[in-house]
């Protein structure tokens, strides 16, 4: 969490941002809140990106003003116009690109004063893994697949019964470049699995950590997956 204050001159207002990550090709949110004003027409929101000349987005007098916007953001940005009045200056970024990563500044002007806060935005690809029993294999084998990751992640297997065991000798992980030549499909195979055990396939890079669990018994198979973004800090 980053909390910024205004500069000298007018009174300062508190602006708060939260570091976040964007999934390439999907829509992302750059989070920013501020002390609200009673008049929408008095609120100016400016989003800037370090190292980029044009504005990322500008909202003033109750509407978007994009005449000073940088080409790299053209047609890809929007604020939540109906929420500006309550202090939400968050930016929706469409079709996140790898190059959108960097330091952003959320700058606010209201009748109460001015303030700003920076936000670190990471970009990459992350997806939920799915773990299945590979019935085609000669021995009891689990196959963990996740369709989109970038940068290349690490894959670690764990089991509930053999806690702390190192499965690197009995697993094989491959990364297959997807058609857009950036993200990769992750496939990891675990051999010699035993029944009545829960196995976890953990995929992690510097942006996200995802886990796929599978519980194999004689009568059923249970699966569970979850994904967590790393380093979400507020400013």
């Amino acid at each position: 969490l980053i909390i910024g204050f205004g500069i000298s001159g007018r009174h300062s207002i508190t602006v708060t941002t939260v570091a976040s990550a964007g999934n390439i090709g999907e829509d992302g949110i750059l989070s920013c809140t501020f002390e609200p004003d009673i008049k929408l027409s008095d609120i100016v929101i400016q989003w800037l990106k370090e190292g980029v000349l044009g504005l990322v987005h500008e909202f003033k007098e109750g509407k978007d003003e994009l005449s000073e916007q940088d080409e790299m953001f053209r047609g890809r940005t929007a604020v939540f116009a109906d929420q500006v009045i309550v202090g939400n200056a968050s930016l929706r970024l469409k079709n996140v690109q790898l190059t959108d990563a960097g330091t952003y500044k959320c700058y606010i002007i209201t009748s109460k004063g001015k303030g700003n806060a920076n936000l670190e935005y990471k970009t990459g690809a992350f997806s939920m893994p799915e773990v299945n029993v590979d019935y085609n294999a000669s021995s009891e084998t689990l196959r963990c697949e996740a369709p989109r990751w970038f940068p290349q992640p690490t894959v670690v297997w764990a089991s509930q019964v053999d806690q702390g065991a190192n499965f690197s000798e009995v697993s094989n992980t491959s990364f297959e470049l997807n058609s857009e030549n950036v993200t990769m499909k992750v496939v990891s195979v675990l051999y010699n699995v035993t029944i009545n055990n829960t196995y976890s396939c953990m995929i992690e890079n510097d942006i996200a950590k995802a886990t796929g669990d599978i519980k194999v018994t004689e009568s059923e198979i249970k699966r569970r997956s979850h994904l967590q973004l790393l380093n979400s800090k507020a400013s």
Epitope: L48, L55, E65, K105
Partner: antibody
């Protein structure tokens, strides 16, 4: 390649009028704010006017307010500056410039305006 | 109106020398909208540095900018003959937009 080409300058008598044009190419003109900046002989730069992409926001320097009018034709990628009630102190090189991030990132080569009797 | 005062008005430097030009604003410049331009004799101005410290496209790394609030500077790490020009600061924070009076840099 971004290009801005000014035209329409010349010699005009005090009290006279002149219309300058700036032809833009190499970028999406209809999305961009535009400025006029002038420079009197052997002097510094003076910002005189700005128009946003949709012509809904226009600003003028006090020195030209009420005498100069900025406009644009997005269909023709052209910026204009209509100058009336010209004075000797309006003698200058006039530049059009593209607005980007509240800076002026591309400038034309300028067109010279001389106000003299 | 934000008045920008540049100093010095004129200066001469030898090749290889470090140069610093100053720009003082009459009131605080918000959103870091303080920019620097270079105008070589007989040419149009060219954007040199934007938002205090970011080099515009194609600008050599010997140029740098710094500052905050009301006090800003442009530095040339090692003066070269091709840097002979007039340098202007400009603020985009308030209307009217304003330029500094310029600093003419000559070579010794």
């Amino acid at each position: 390649e971004v290009q801005l080409v000014e035209s329409g300058g010349g010699l005009v008598k005090p009290g006279g009028s002149l219309k300058l044009s700036c032809a833009a190419s190499g970028f999406t003109f209809s999305d961009s704010g535009m400025h006029w900046v002038r420079q009197a002989p052997e002097k510094g730069l003076e910002w005189i006017t700005y128009i946003n992409s949709g012509s809904s926001t226009i600003y003028y320097a006090d020195s030209v307010k009420g005498r100069f009018t900025i406009s644009r034709d997005n269909a023709k990628n052209t910026l204009f500056l209509q100058m009336t009630s010209l004075r000797s102190e309006d003698t200058a090189m006039y530049y059009c410039a593209r607005g980007r991030g509240y800076a002026m990132d591309y400038w034309g080569q300028g067109t010279s305006v001389t106000v003299s009797s | 109106e934000i008045v920008l005062t540049q100093s010095p008005t004129t200066m001469a430097a030898s090749p290889g020398e470090k140069i610093t030009i100053f720009c003082s604003a009459s009131s605080s410049i918000s959103s870091d909208f303080l920019h620097w331009y270079q105008q070589k004799p007989g040419f149009s101005p060219k954007l040199l540095i934007y938002r205090i410290s970011n080099l515009a496209s194609g600008v050599p790394a010997r140029f740098s900018g710094s500052g905050s609030g009301t006090s800003y500077s442009l530095t040339i790490g090692t003066m070269e003959a091709e840097d002979v020009a007039t340098y202007y600061c400009q603020q985009g924070s308030n209307v009217p937009r304003t330029f500094g009076g310029g600093t003419k840099l000559e070579i010794k």
